[in-house]
Interface confidence: medium
């Protein structure tokens, strides 16, 4: 067995679905998606053996399924995979990369081969401990590298400020495939917002830490950089689910106001 | 073997200025930040300022910022230190280390120190 | 800025001694920690990084310990050429800041 989870159920059904919902999102001109030629695209990794998967197996499907990102919408992360889909907002507020059609359609799915057949793997899937060019790491790779080739404008990243080993992990996709595909000249700054959790430890914050290392990089880069702490758009929708908690309170302006009223 | 010299120190009335230099040899010096660390007489250590290993990033005291300027040349492997609009609070012997690698901030080799004296 | 303090700033201890010197951030500090050794009418010397890593070539006598905002370098038996101020930094944050140091001397 692989140690990682096997594939998931209904798979085709959830990517045709997927892909035909998201059809609706994008622009007239850009409307002409054929899912079915997408999934196509998409099975040929699965009729390999899946330790020999590659990034550039999924070129095909990326063709395919790409278009064009508005610009000052990126929304990249680490660590915040939840977080980041519901203050997105299915492409209203931003569009990361689980909103864009390539990234939707494999959003929190796995998938492979088995081994020696050529059916699915319904009971487990290689991770990056078990090989390095399995089917999952391979396609956010590709699709990683995309994203970020076709970022424009801002640039927004969240990242966890209360993950234990740091906001920014130093091997992770935003190092090695995202940052490395920034086209510089597309790119007016970066901006980086570290969210902690609500009650959660304050591990790392701008300017501490990892953090530290994702600045040098990006200025050594040539990038605009700029880093806000628990950027209160992204907080307030964390304080949904913890509206009694002290990190929640209002300001006294607000509270006075609301007094008032 | 690495070696950090520095030079350009001496006596300077207040508020005028002084370049300090720092020749490095013995490892690449544009795979390492660097810093300036400087130490009043009989006094504990003071980080004053740092440069990222291409010069993308500087970073300052605060009683520094505006009135000093770190800044690298890779082609020359040297590191200066352009002090204008001195007080005599910047009298310390001024260090020139090297930071250990691209991710941390300690210092690994320093320089002999340079004396700046600033007084009229 | 993350202050830093040493205690004690004087330590008197014989050859032999186990020699125990603290320092203590003002906040959380994720054991980005170094301390140093600084001998009279010298530069520094790096000995312990990341709070408990033995830089190369520092004898083994000398150890690092803690974590979060309380951190301690023992010098397991103290010898004579030891003698010296000893300062800790934390660099976490942009602003890299140093202890007052402990200055070591014999009985």
């Known amino acids: 067995r692989w140690r990682g989870e096997g594939t998931s159920a209904h798979l085709r059904d959830i990517f045709l679905g997927r892909c035909a919902e998201y059809r609706a999102l994008l622009s007239p001109e850009q409307r002409n998606k054929n899912c079915t030629a997408i999934w196509e695209a998409f099975k040929v990794a699965l009729d390999k053996d899946p330790c020999s998967v590659l990034p550039s197996d999924y070129d095909l499907f990326i063709n395919l399924s790409r278009h064009s990102i508005p610009r000052d919408k990126s929304l990249f992360w680490e660590n915040s995979h939840l977080l980041v889909n519901s203050f997105a907002d299915n492409t209203r507020r931003f569009m990361p990369l689980s909103d864009v059609l390539y990234g939707r359609v494999a959003d929190f799915l796995s998938w492979c081969r088995q081994k020696n057949d050529s059916g699915l793997d319904y009971q487990s899937c290689p991770t990056s401990e078990d090989c390095e060019n399995n089917p999952v790491d391979s396609f956010w790779k590709r699709a990683s590298i995309q994203y970020s080739k076709d970022s424009s404008g801002v640039i927004h990243v969240m990242l966890n400020g209360s993950e234990p080993t740091g906001a920014y992990p130093i091997k992770g996709f935003f190092a090695d495939y995202e940052i490395p595909n920034l086209q510089k000249e597309k790119i007016t700054r970066i901006e980086i917002w570290v969210m902690h959790e609500i009650g959660g430890p304050n591990v790392e914050s701008c300017g501490e830490g990892s953090m530290k290392v994702l600045e040098k990089r990006l200025k050594d880069m040539g990038f605009q950089y700029s880093c806000i702490n628990d950027y209160r758009p992204v907080k307030l929708l964390q304080c949904v689910d913890h509206s009694t908690h002290p990190d929640c309170a209002l300001k006294s302006a607000a509270a006075a106001t609301q007094r008032k009223a | 073997e690495v070696h950090l010299v520095e030079s350009g120190g001496g006596l300077v009335q207040p508020g005028r200025s002084l370049k300090l230099s720092c020749a490095a040899s013995g490892f690449t010096f544009s795979n390492y930040d660097m810093a300036w660390i400087r130490q009043a007489p009989a006094k504990g250590l003071e980080w004053v300022a740092s440069i990222s290993i291409r010069g993308g990033s500087t970073y300052y005291r605060d009683s520094v910022k505006g009135r000093f300027t770190v800044s690298r040349d890779n082609a020359k492997s040297t590191l200066y230190l352009q002090m204008d609009s001195l007080r005599s609070e910047d009298t310390a012997t001024y260090y020139c280390?090297?930071?250990?690698?691209?991710?941390?901030?300690?210092?690994?080799?320093w320089g002999q120190g340079v004396m700046v004296t600033v007084s009229s | 800025n993350i202050q830093m303090t040493q205690s004690p700033s004087l330590l008197s201890a014989s050859v032999g001694d186990r020699v125990t010197l603290s320092c203590k951030a003002g906040?959380?500090?994720?054991?980005?920690l170094a301390w140093y050794q600084q001998m009279l009418g010298e530069a520094p010397k790096l000995l312990i990084y990341n709070a408990n890593s033995l830089q190369t070539g520092i004898p083994s006598r000398f150890s690092g310990s803690g974590s979060g905002t309380d951190y301690t370098l023992t010098i397991s038996s103290l010898q004579p050429e030891d003698v010296a101020t000893y300062f800790c930094?934390?660099?976490?944050?942009?602003?890299?800041?140093f202890g007052a140091g402990t200055k070591l001397e014999l009985k």
């Open positions: 280390v090297r930071g250990t690698d691209y991710y941390y901030d300690y210092f690994d080799y």
């Open positions: 930094q934390q660099y976490n944050s942009w602003t890299n800041t």
């Open positions: 906040r959380n500090i994720n054991s980005y």
